[in-house]
Structures are given as structure tokens and as C-alpha cells.
């Protein structure tokens, strides 16, 4: 029966001190891990991999390196200036045999617009990806190649959550055996046909994504073909049956009252840690109302925060969240009005999310300002608008054509925004920097590994 199928990939997620520094608290970091895992879980569960369905993810264990671990010699991720390949290697030098995949989340600005890196799975041979066990490689080091890394920063800006979620799905896609999409069928965003182009590219597109187009969080047929072959061969090696919550992973799942991790991590006076006996672990201690592991509206003294306490900051598109006095969860924030400017006037709010382009405020569509002869490269990092479905009207917000809407003001894209038809990202100097999708691979080729390994790493 389906219920007995091995369809769950168990994850080990580590975060470095820079990720902690950006999000500020353990709870906020756990919320980020949870939202990333939920996002990829939804994507993979709703994809039919040639008959293999309901592929899901579960966090088996987390390790949060806080700013206190910045100087800890046992923390391999403590170094401030590490390139993306070295960062992945540090993850791979740990033994991850207990997990399907092991990831590190960071807040580092890697070179050339790289948002992630992962070893690519293959149906046969030992090459990396899902379920790969630790072994000795030709550089004399033992490595686990069931690994990947992602960062939430690009050219000095933080990427929107939807983009970060797709980055995670993309890197995990590599682990599951998918190379980058290529060919007209699997890169519709590069099509000359407007109808195809407007739906954008799929998850495994090699370059940039905005995360808001129809195909952006779907796998292409090319990816599905590759992933199904790897799942067919590898999932019985380490996937588990889904269903049971994992006490100790720091996330409160169905069947758990709370989850403050294992005894070495649990700083919570309210919750029994995962090393306690079966009947007690991940349960509230007697007389305690709540645990901070359940949400930000619970105090360290195990009581619900009062009605007026803030639990979420005001953002561009949503008002602050306020505790309601009878749950540990932070209630949903009220959205700001649709078409409120956000992301420094480059976008507008839609249903509480900074999702639409500023062009939409005036009934226009965003487009890429790029002349075929490449002469107007300086406009590639301008916000450009066009009349709906009419690319011949595409012009910068500062142009004569859109003066009545923008009063001659040139609105520039935020650093880290996709540009030139998703071929690159804008840097801080407003230059569109093309993504060299296989750059780290080329650099690794010159490094210490044996040649057969190089085939199997990708961004």
C-alpha cells in the first residue's frame, strides 16, 4: 500500500552564525528552516515523478550555530570569508550517513550571483546526491556527498522568501539527479513566443528566477525524467515511511506539544527535551501553559504573552503582528492596501506580499529593457514597463513614454534582482552581471578532487 512506501527524505539542517545574525533568534531561525522545508515539501509532493508520487521531506535534526559559535574551533563554518565551493566542502567533510540530505543555510554574499551549490545525484555509481554515504576520496579525505548549501543574500541584498525557497528546491533537485534545464521544451522563459515566455522558466533553470511566474516552482519534464531515474534506484537506500513526527528536531509537529530539541540544545524550562522517556519527551512540563518552541507569543516563563505584545515587525506590505493572549502562535498580520509601494518603490503589495511590479500600479507589465544590439546595457537594471502583451512599448520608468506615471524618475532594480531576461542579477553598481551557472564546477576541477567527481556538482 501507499502508506508503507518509502517516500520521505530526512534532512539535517545546519545554519551558520551569519544566518543567525541576520534572523536574530533561535525561534526565527527555526521558522526559516520550517518555511523552507514546507516549501520544498509542497513542490515535491505535488510532482509526479513518472509514477513515483508523494515525495516528502522531514527535518530529522537541526544545528543552529549562533553568534556565540563564531569563535568555536569545533564549528567548521566559523570562518568569515569562504568561497561557495569551500563552504560546500566544509559541509561534506562531516559524516551525514544518518540522513538523506544535509544542508547548511547561510547569509553570505558569494561571488557571481551564486545562491546555492549541491552535489548531483545519478542513478548508478557513487557520485553524490540523495542517500550517498561517507567515503574516502582521492584527496585523502572522507566526505559525505549527500550535501548542499544555500544563501539568502545576493549582491548585498536579501532575496525574497519565494526565491530562497526555489533556490532550496533547485539545489535539492540537483541532489535528486537533475542537471540544469536546457533545450526549448524545458526553458520556455527564453522563448521568442510570448505565450510561452510569460510563464517563465522551471525550477532547474540555470540562471536567475523571480519566483512569481507560473513555471518557477514546477519541475520541467527534463527534470522529472532525470529525477525519476534516481528515485527509482536510490530511494530504498535511505528514504523512510512518512508519518511519525520527529521529537528533537526543534519543530512542533502533529502529535507533539512542544519541541525544544535534544538535551544539549534545549534551553527551555517549559518542555521536556527529546532525551526524556517516551511518555514525556516533546510534552509540556506540568503546569506550563506553553513553550517558546510553539511560537513567539510564549514567554520564557512558559505563559502566553499578553494581548498587546508585538510578535512580528511591520513590513512593507503587512502591519505588525500582535499576540492575542491565548495562543503561542503569532496571528496573521493585516495586509496593507494592494498597490502600496514596496521594496524601495520597485514593486507593489498584492494581498500582503511584496509581489507585483511597480508597473502593475499603472496597468502595465514589467519587461526587460534590452536592445538586441546590446547598446543599452545601462538600462538592464532599470525597472522597465510595457503595455500588456506589447513588447514594442517596453521602456524604462524614466522614459518619455511613461512620464505621466513616473514623472521622469528612473527607478532602478534592487541589487540582486534578476535582469536581462533572467540571464543575470543586478549588482550594487546597477550593472547586470550574467550568471555563470557552472563557474564553481570549473573552479573545483582545478582543485583537489579526482576528475570523476567533477561531473556531479552544480549550482
Amino acid at each position: 500500500t501507499t502508506s508503507a512506501e518509502k517516500n520521505t527524505c530526512q534532512l539535517y539542517i545546519q545554519t551558520d552564525h551569519l544566518f543567525f545574525k541576520y534572523y536574530g533568534t533561535r525561534e526565527a531561525v527555526i521558522a526559516q528552516i520550517s518555511s523552507h522545508v514546507k516549501a520544498i515539501d509542497t513542490i515535491y509532493q505535488t510532482t509526479d515523478f513518472s509514477g513515483i508520487r508523494n515525495i516528502s521531506f522531514m527535518v530529522k535534526r537541526i544545528r543552529i550555530n549562533t553568534t556565540a559559535d563564531e569563535k568555536d574551533p569545533t564549528n567548521p563554518f566559523r570562518f568569515p570569508n569562504i568561497g561557495v565551493e569551500k563552504f560546500l566542502e566544509l559541509n561534506s567533510e562531516q559524516n551525514h550517513d544518518d540522513y538523506c540530505l544535509a544542508y547548511v543555510f547561510t547569509d553570505r554574499d558569494f561571488d557571481d550571483g551564486v545562491l546555492g551549490l549541491a552535489w548531483v545525484g545519478a542513478p548508478s555509481g557513487s557520485s553524490g546526491g540523495i542517500c550517498e554515504k561517507s567515503k574516502l576520496y582521492s584527496d585523502g579525505k572522507k566526505k559525505s556527498l549527500n550535501t548542499g548549501i544555500i544563501t539568502v543574500q545576493n549582491y548585498g541584498s536579501h532575496v525574497p522568501p519565494k526565491v530562497s525557497h526555489i533556490t532550496f528546491a533547485h539545489e535539492v533537485g540537483h541532489n535528486f539527479g537533475s542537471p540544469h534545464d536546457s533545450g526549448t521544451e524545458c526553458t520556455p522563459g527564453e522563448s521568442k513566443n510570448l505565450g510561452q515566455k510569460e510563464n517563465g522558466n522551471y525550477i532547474m533553470y540555470a540562471r536567475a528566477t523571480s519566483g512569481d511566474k507560473l513555471n518557477n516552482n514546477k519541475f520541467s519534464l527534463c527534470s522529472i525524467r532525470n529525477i525519476s531515474q534516481v528515485l527509482e534506484k536510490k530511494r530504498n537506500n535511505c528514504f523512510v515511511e512518512s508519518g511519525q513526527p520527529i521529537c528533537g528536531n526543534g519543530m512542533v509537529e502533529q502529535g507533539e506539544e512542544c519541541d525544544c530539541g535534544y538535551s544539549d540544545q534545549c534551553k527551555d524550562e517549559c518542555c521536556f527535551d527529546a532525551n526524556q522517556p517516551e511518555g514525556r519527551k516533546c510534552k509540556l512540563k506540568p503546569g506550563k501553559q506553553c513553550s517558546p518552541s510553539q511560537g513567539p507569543c510564549c514567554t520564557a516563563q512558559c505563559a502566553f504573552k499578553s494581548k498587546s505584545e508585538k510578535c512580528r515587525d511591520d513590513s512593507d506590505c503587512a502591519r505588525e503582528g500582535i499576540c492575542n493572549g491565548f495562543t503561542a502562535l503569532c496571528p496573521a498580520s493585516d495586509p496593507k492596501p494592494n498597490f502600496t509601494d514596496c521594496n524601495r518603490h520597485t514593486q507593489v503589495c498584492i494581498n500582503g506580499q511584496c509581489a507585483g511590479s511597480i508597473c502593475e500600479k499603472y496597468g502595465l507589465e514589467e519587461c526587460t529593457c534590452a536592445s538586441s544590439d546590446g547598446k543599452d546595457d545601462k538600462e538592464l537594471c532599470h525597472v522597465c514597463c510595457m503595455k500588456k502583451m506589447d513588447p514594442s512599448t517596453c521602456a524604462s520608468t524614466g522614459s518619455v513614454q511613461w512620464s505621466r506615471h513616473f514623472s521622469g524618475r528612473t527607478i532602478t532594480l534592487q541589487p540582486g534582482s534578476p535582469c536581462n531576461d533572467f540571464r543575470g542579477y543586478c549588482d550594487v553598481f546597477m550593472r547586470c552581471r550574467l550568471v555563470d551557472a557552472d563557474g564553481p564546477l570549473a573552479r573545483l576541477k582545478k582543485a583537489i578532487f579526482s576528475p570523476e567527481l567533477y561531473e556531479n556538482i552544480a549550482e
Epitope: A395, S396, S399, V400, Q401, S403, G408, T410
Partner: nanobody, 119 residues
């Protein structure tokens, strides 16, 4: 290089008219789109009107439509803004601007002329 100099501003009563001029130096005046913008104290710059190379096409901000008229004299290298039925909210510094094409940014800007409409 195009240099733009505005004139014709002043202090008027609500309901009065004014005609602003913008003189352009350079022989290529007729190959530039011309526009007028204004900026009230403490506010962002606001589009008023623009006119195509030949003068055949014009566009106006909703707030001035029917009251203001933009015209150009290519022989005299000048663009005009005729402002009728002026209102206190029309007060501001009026600047003219030039651009080589519809899809290009406004490349050249004048210093501006002050228009004050009292009630």
C-alpha cells in the same frame, strides 16, 4: 549638448493665465521630445505635459488636462506651456526637459522658473 532656459514664471491670482517658454540651444531641437515638469515645495517632481518631435502628439497629466496646452516652434527652438484657469495647487517650480526618443530617459533639464498662484 542641449541647454534649456525657462522664462515666463511669476505671481498670479487664481483663475489667471501664464505662458511659459523654454528656449533650447543647439541645432537639433527638432529631434528631441520636449516636456514640462513641476515641483511644489516639499513634494516630488510631477509630470505636466510632453510633446512629440513634430508637435503632432501631446500628453498631459490628468490634473492639467483642458487647462494647459503644450506647443513647440521648431524654427525658433522653443517649447511653450500655456496655462489657463490657474489654481493655487499649480504653484511650483516649472522645468522643461528634452529627450531624443519616446523610449529614452529625459536627458537634459532646465533650471526652472517659479510659478506662484495665490488665492
Amino acid at each position: 549638448e542641449v541647454q534649456l532656459v525657462e522664462s515666463g514664471g511669476g505671481l498670479v491670482q487664481a483663475g489667471d493665465s501664464l505662458r511659459l517658454s523654454c528656449a533650447a540651444s543647439g541645432r537639433t531641437f527638432s529631434s528631441y521630445y520636449m516636456g514640462w515638469f513641476r515641483q511644489a515645495p516639499g513634494k516630488e517632481r510631477e509630470f505636466v505635459a510632453h510633446i512629440s518631435l513634430s508637435g503632432g502628439n501631446t500628453e498631459y497629466a490628468d490634473s492639467v488636462k483642458g487647462r494647459f496646452t503644450i506647443t513647440r516652434d521648431n524654427a525658433g527652438n522653443t517649447v511653450y506651456l500655456q496655462m489657463n484657469s490657474l489654481k493655487p495647487e499649480d504653484t511650483g517650480v516649472y522645468c522643461c526637459a528634452a529627450s531624443p526618443s519616446l523610449r529614452s530617459a529625459w536627458q537634459y533639464w532646465g533650471q526652472g522658473t517659479q510659478v506662484t498662484v495665490s488665492s
